[in-house]
Amino acid sequence: PLATIPVSTTSLTSSEGSTISTPSVDISTPVTTSIVGDQCSRCKNGGFWDGLKCQCLTPYYGESCEEVVNSIDIAPPETVSAQMELTVTVTSVKFTDELKNHSSQEFREFNKTFTEQMNIVYSGIPEYVGVNITNLRLGSVVVEHDVLLRTKYTPEYKTALDNATEVVKQKITKVTTEQIMTNDNCSALMCFNTTGTQVQNITVTQYDPVEECRQKAEEYEDYFLVEYRDQKPYCISPCESGFNASKNCNHGKCQMSQNGARCLCVTTETHWYSGEDCNQGTQKSHHHHHH
C-alpha cells in the first residue's frame, strides 16, 4: 500500500511510486554528521556548523546540507591571454654589454625603439597588448621577447587567440623579411636578419568551464552540464529551469539524486500524478486517465 504524508493538501510522489513530503531528504544522498563544540547539528555532506547554521559545501544546500543545488556558480576569467616567446635579430644596432643592464641608457633607448617598432608591426591585431624584452645577446642584437595577446572570454576564445598568434607570426616574418640592411644602410626604424626570426613557444590561458563544472559538482558530475547564455557558461543540473537540458516535471518537483534528476509528482485533492515526467494524471473520484 502507498504511504501518503500530507503537506497541507499537497504531497509529492516519486515517479517510482512512493509519496514523499517536500522539502525532502533524499535517502540516496550519503550522510555524514558534523558535531562542533556543544552544538550537535546534522550537517551532512561535509557541511559544518558555524554556531548558527550549517555551512554547506558545493553542491549542497538546505538546513542540513541535504539538498543538491540546481546550478553551480562557475566564473570564467573576464579576459584570457596568450604569450608568444619570440626571437628576432636586429642588425641596425651594435651589441654592447650595456644592453644587458636594464637600467642603462642603451637598454632604455633600445627597448623604447624596439617597442615602437613592434607596436607598428602589430597595430592591426585587436588582441595585441605589447612586447616585453626578456633578454638581449650578441649577434648583432638577438632580441628574446614576449608578445602579449589578450581577448575577452568567449566560448571561442582559443580560436580567437590561435588566429591572433598566426597573424603575429605572419607580421613578424613580413617585417623581418622586408626591413633588412641593403648596402650597409637601414632606412627604417630598425632592420633585421631574416633568418633570425623564430617562434620559441606559445602559452595560451587554459580555461574549461565543463571541467570546472564537473569538479564542483563532485559525485553529481555526470548529471551537471554546461550551457551558454549570452556567451556566458552556466553549470546546471536538469532541475534548473529555462535551459535546453532542463527537465520538465509538469505536475511535480525536480530533485537531484545520485542516480540523476527525477520528478517527485504532486498528489492534489482531486488528482494523482505519475510517470517519469509527472504528466499522467489520474482523477481520484473517477479513476480514469487523462493527458
Epitope: 633607448e109 633600445f110 650597409d184 644602410n185 632592420c191
Partner: nanobody, 124 residues
Framework: EVQLVESGGGLVQPGRSLRLSCAAS???????MGWFRQAPGKEREGVAG???????GYADSVKGRFTISKDNAKNSLYLQMNSLRAEDTALYSC???????????????????RGQGTMVTVSS
Amino acid sequence: EVQLVESGGGLVQPGRSLRLSCAASGDITRRCMGWFRQAPGKEREGVAGISEDGITGYADSVKGRFTISKDNAKNSLYLQMNSLRAEDTALYSCAASILNRVGCRQLSYEYIYRGQGTMVTVSS
C-alpha cells in the same frame, strides 16, 4: 632622454651662407645624427646625415652646397649652408638616433630624438 637645441637660423639673402648648430644634452659619439627641414605647407625632408664613424649623406637638392659635421667632444652637430636659395627657406631641426645605431647611410632613417628647430628664411 637626449635634448637637442638648434641655433643659428635667421633671415639671409640668396647666395649667402649660414651655419646652424645643434647642442645635445648627452653623448653623440655613438649616434647617427641628421638635419631635417620642413618648408611651410610641405612635408619634412632629410637634408644631411652623419653616421657614428663620420660617413655623410646628403639630399640631392643640397649636395655640394651644404656640409654636415659633428664635434663629439662638444656634443654638437653642425650644418654649414652655402649658396642659399629661396627654396631653402624652412624650419631646420636636428635629430639623433638611439645609441650604437649602425647602417644610417641615407636620410630616410627614423631618428628617435628631435629638436624644436630653427627657422631659416632666404629672401632678398
